[in-house]
Structures are given as C-alpha cells and as structure tokens.
C-alpha cells in the first residue's frame, strides 16, 4: 500500500515545539512525501518560500537513507488561488510554458514527481484541468525517453460531491495520473452553524441530503462509480481536527455554535487544531465517539473538536483495504506529534505510525 504524506513548508514558522523542518521527518514512515507548495510565476513553476531550495534539499536527502522513498512537489494550494491556475490552464501557450518548466525544476531539486493541488477548478475549468493533466503526463513520458525514470504525476482532489461534479472528469484524469489523493476531510465547518465531524468515515444517523454526501465512504464510493480505479485512489486521513465554539450548553453532534474554535497555541488558526494541540486539549476534556461515523470528538468548556485518533485511523485503513484502494494519504506530517512530546506516548508521528502499522497488518 501507498502511504502518501504531505509536509507543509510554512510549518517551519510555527513557534517553539510546533516548528517543523523536513529533517525531522522519518525517512521510513511514508512511501511518498509531498512537499507543499510550489508557486507558479510568469507561467513557470517556482519556489514559494525564501528558503524552499534549502528545504527541498533537506527533504530529498532522506532518500539517501531510504532509496525506496519517493518525493513529489505539490503546486498550488489555497493561497495560490483557483483563478491563477485557471488562467494558466485555459491558455494554450501559458499551459505549454508551465508544463515545459516542470521536469527540469523537479530534476534540479531532486523530486520524483509533481502533485497538482488546484483548489479547485471551476465548472468552466473542468476540461482545462483534464487537458493540463493529459499534457503534463505526455511531457513526463517524453522527458523520460533518454532512459531516465519517469516523473510521477498525482493530484489532490476534493471529496465534496458538488466540487467533484463541477470540477473533475474523473474517468479521464484517472487515466493519466499515477495516483489520486482524495481529500476526505473538511466535510463540516463553522459555516454550517452546528457542530459536526469534518472527516467521518460513514454517514451519520441524522444526516439527510446534502449531509448524506459529507463522509469518506460516500466520497470514495462516488469516485469509484465515476471511473477512478481503486488501484489509483489514495484516501485522505487528517492529522488535524476542526473545532467550534459552542453557543449553548448542548455539546453533542449538531449542537449550535457561535463560530470556529479558538486558535491553537502553535497553529494559530481559528477552527483548526493540530493533533499535537488536540493531545494538549484532551487533558481535562470529555471524549466521545460518534459510533456510526467511527470518529471521536472532545469537548471542554465551550470548545468542541472533531478529530482522528489511533482507533479511528485504524478503522479508516481497514475500510480502504476492504475497498482495495491504493493506500492512505496524510495531511500533514507536521500536524502529527512529530516530536513525540505532546501525546503522552513519546512515539514520534503516532497517528501516521498507526496508519502505517494498519496498512502493514494482514
């Protein structure tokens, strides 16, 4: 099985024990590590951070010790914006320039492939996204002709039904991608006005349309029905939780909220907590399991957080094995307890290790 793990370059800027550099990553933990994110400037793939080149080198030296490890560079992301991607993909010349710039950039910096993180193509971009993928793959095939190992091509796709319908021609893009990471998280957010788990495995008992689509099982099944081969589908598992501030004394699933949860001490983003911050939060919190959805949530005071733990990730891995998927994807290594100093077990990367162990189990 594949274990595809994202690393985010901005995690270096977190304070103190939250600061993560690629040299802290376990070289034997994942089969693929994807560095997020690269930029596109003047239609050419480019660095984003001032020290990306240093960090690329740091990441890719892990392969000196584990030659089986593959590294990819992810281009795009939330801050890049859909519009900029749209302009490049929809213009033949811009698209060609971008595609041509990719292989030398990846080779120069020691990457084994490219991950496309266009979040997200609009309805009018659907065909252009397909063309971008098809032409990128053709360029990778051509570039590898002189006996080089062919560069890998993957894409991170939304797990939301509405986005899937408007953004992707699943059957066509699947032909050209080496694997597809389906982002089976962020199903539920503060915009809903109530508590809810952002990455449930199954539909909740109370879920009616459109909530019945907001779970991992539905998203995976839908992708498969649309023509994604199970052998290319990698299922996303988050090492972060989504938090809410409760608006009343109700604390269950569906309780009213006044907004996102308070920012974490290290990630400093309202409504999001890294797993290592959740481990801190759990001291003195009340933990519940949403039985049907097979995921936990915890409450403390007026704070509510839905997250994944070692038990829930094992259930998710068993599910992806039952569906004969290609493996699991983790967002993100730097949100796991990468130092092993928060979650009371001392183990570094406890969630990702639990996923790895479950994938290896017979």
């Amino acid at each position: 099985y594949k274990l595809v793990c994202y690393y985010t370059s901005w995690s270096q800027y977190r304070e103190g024990d939250g600061s993560c550099f690629p040299d802290a990553l376990d070289r034997f933990l994942c089969t693929h590590i994807i560095y997020s994110f690269a930029n596109i400037s003047n239609d050419h793939i480019d660095t984003w951070e001032w020290n990306d080149v240093t960090l690329y080198g740091m990441l890719n030296t892990l392969k000196n010790r584990n030659p089986n490890l593959k590294t990819l560079l992810s281009v795009g992301g939330w801050n890049f914006g859909s519009q900029r991607f749209s302009k490049i993909a929809s213009n033949t010349q811009s698209r060609r320039t971008f595609i041509k710039s990719v292989p030398p950039f990846l080779r120069t910096h020691g990457f084994d492939g490219l991950d496309l993180a266009w979040l997200y193509p609009g309805r009018r971009d659907k065909q252009h996204f397909t063309t971008l993928i098809k032409e990128m793959k053709a360029e990778f095939i051509k570039e590898a002709q002189p006996g080089k190992k062919q560069l890998l091509l993957s894409a991170a796709l939304s797990a939301g039904k509405v986005t899937i319908d408007s953004s992707y021609d699943i059957a066509k893009i699947s032909q050209h991608l080496d694997f597809i990471s389906i982002m089976t998280y962020d199903f539920h957010g503060a915009w809903r006005g109530t508590t809810g788990h952002h990455s449930p495995l199954f539909r909740g008992q109370e879920d009616a349309s459109p909530d019945r689509f907001s779970n991992t099982d539905y998203a995976v099944g839908y992708m498969l029905r649309l023509g994604a081969p199970a052998s290319k589908l990698v299922m996303g598992i988050p090492t972060f939780g989504r938090s809410f501030t409760l608006a009343s004394s109700e604390t269950g699933v569906g309780a009213p909220i006044s907004g996102p949860g308070i920012p974490g001490r290290f990630t400093k983003e309202a409504g999001t907590l890294a797993y290592y911050e959740i481990c801190d939060f759990l001291r003195g919190a009340t933990v519940h399991r949403i039985l049907g959805q097979q995921v936990p949530y915890a409450t403390k005071g007026n704070q509510w957080v839905g997250y994944d733990d070692q038990e829930s990730v094992k259930s998710k891995v068993q599910y992806l094995k039952d569906r004969q998927l290609a493996g699991a994807m983790v967002w993100a290594l730097d949100l796991d307890d990468f130092q092993g100093s928060f979650c009371g077990q001392d183990l570094r990367f406890p969630l990702t290790n639990a996923i790895k162990d479950a994938l290896a189990a017979t």
């Epitope: 600061s19 550099f21 040299d23 100093s341 077990q345 570094r348």
Partner: antibody, heavy 118, light 106 residues
C-alpha cells in the same frame, strides 16, 4: 570534515550553573542539521540532553527541561549549554554532537569531564 | 521513555570467533543505531538504520532486528573490535541509549 570541540570549567560547585561551549569547524551551524549535547555518567550511561536546530529552535530532554538552556553565537560558530542548579549527580563527561539523519549522532566532540563538587 | 536493555553486559571472545550482542527495547522501535566506544575516546557511529555500516566500519560487522529485538554481530572477532557497544533509538522521544555491552578479547 566537521569537527566539534567542547570547552568549559572542569569543576563546578553544587547549586551553581554549569556552562559549556561547543566550537564547530568545517560546517556552519546555521547551514543545517541539529547540534546536540549528550553526557556520559561515570558508570558509562549515556543521556541525550537536547539540541539546538540550525534554525535556532531548541528541543530538550523532558527530564532536564526545567533547568537547561541552549544558545548559540553564529558569528563564532559556537553553541552553548547552560545547566542550572547542578548537583554531584551531574558529574559526567559532556559531549557535543551533530546528527546526520534526524535521529542518530554522526559526529562527536572529544568530550569534557565536568565534576560537581564542593 | 523507551528503555534499551543490552545483553550481555560484558563478554569476551577469542580472535576469529563469531560474536553476537543484543538490544531489547521496552516498546517497538522503527530502527536501531549502534556506537562503538573505546576507553578514553568519544563514541563513534558504527551501524545505523539497523543494518547499515558507517564509513570505515569493517564488513565483518552486521546489524539486524525489528520491533523490540535488535542485534549486532561480528562474524570473526579481531583484537581491534574490543570496545563497548551502545544501541540507540529515536523512534520515541527522548532518544535513549542502551547501557552498553563491553566486548573484551580473550
């Protein structure tokens, strides 16, 4: 090749602070890797004390966290250990070291013996 | 923290003899590193990632193991191999060392 050299007093009184310097040659401490302190007690037991990353971030052994701190002087390519409130149990040979992979120690200084005694 | 127990604490071997020492971890670790230390000198990285020999280490040395059980083997003991050998892990925080196996020449 990278070389590390520890220096500092060889005798410290109980309750005082122990301060050691590691001078690095052959590699800049701001260019990469983590720069560690490890000590070896008279019975030969080895204990990792912590590191200062090339970025300046520190990570300490939880058992020492309340009384240890690392700093550095990048202009002199040196990093420093300060251990407060020492007792005779802190008597040890103190080594500075550099990692290769995250998790093992590829380069070591020759060590400096520090005795804590009145 | 993970405790690494090395056995035997002291052993002796004749030149040409095969030597095996073990390192047992209190919880599963991903891989193990080994160091050689001779009297009055600092430890030297000897074997890393369970089985890879550090630069300059003779091919008669090998390492193996997984989970909680690891070992270092010398296929044919030589006088220069007399030293103390320490195992070390950092799968869990903090990194820890074994108490050492002192290998003497007969």
């Amino acid at each position: 090749d990278v070389q590390l050299q520890e220096s500092g007093p060889d005798l410290v009184k109980p309750s005082q602070s122990l301060s050691l310097t590691c001078t690095v040659t052959g590699y800049s401490i701001t260019s990469g890797y983590s720069w560690h302190w490890i000590r070896q007690f008279p019975g030969n037991k080895l204990e990792w004390m912590g590191y200062i990353h090339y970025s300046g971030r520190t990570n300490y052994n939880p058992s020492l966290k309340s009384r240890i701190s690392f700093t550095r002087d990048t202009s002199k390519n040196q990093f420093f250990l300060r251990l407060n409130s020492v007792t005779p149990e802190d008597t040890a040979t103190y080594y500075c070291a550099r990692n290769y992979g995250y998790d093992e120690f590829a380069y070591w200084g020759q060590g400096t013996l520090v005795t804590v005694s009145a | 923290q993970i405790v690494l127990t090395q056995s035997p604490a002291i052993m002796s071997a004749s030149p040409g003899e095969k030597v095996t020492m073990t390192c047992s971890a209190s919880s599963s670790v991903s891989y193990m590193h080994w160091y050689q230390q001779k009297s009055g000198t600092s430890p030297k990285r000897w074997i890393y990632d369970t089985s890879k020999l550090a630069s300059g280490v003779p091919a008669r040395f090998s390492g193996s193991g997984s989970g909680t059980s690891y070992s270092l083997t010398i296929s044919s003991m030589e006088a220069e191999d007399a030293a103390t050998y320490y195992c070390q892990q950092w799968s869990s925080n903090p990194p820890t060392f074994g108490s050492g196996t002192k290998l003497e020449i007969k």
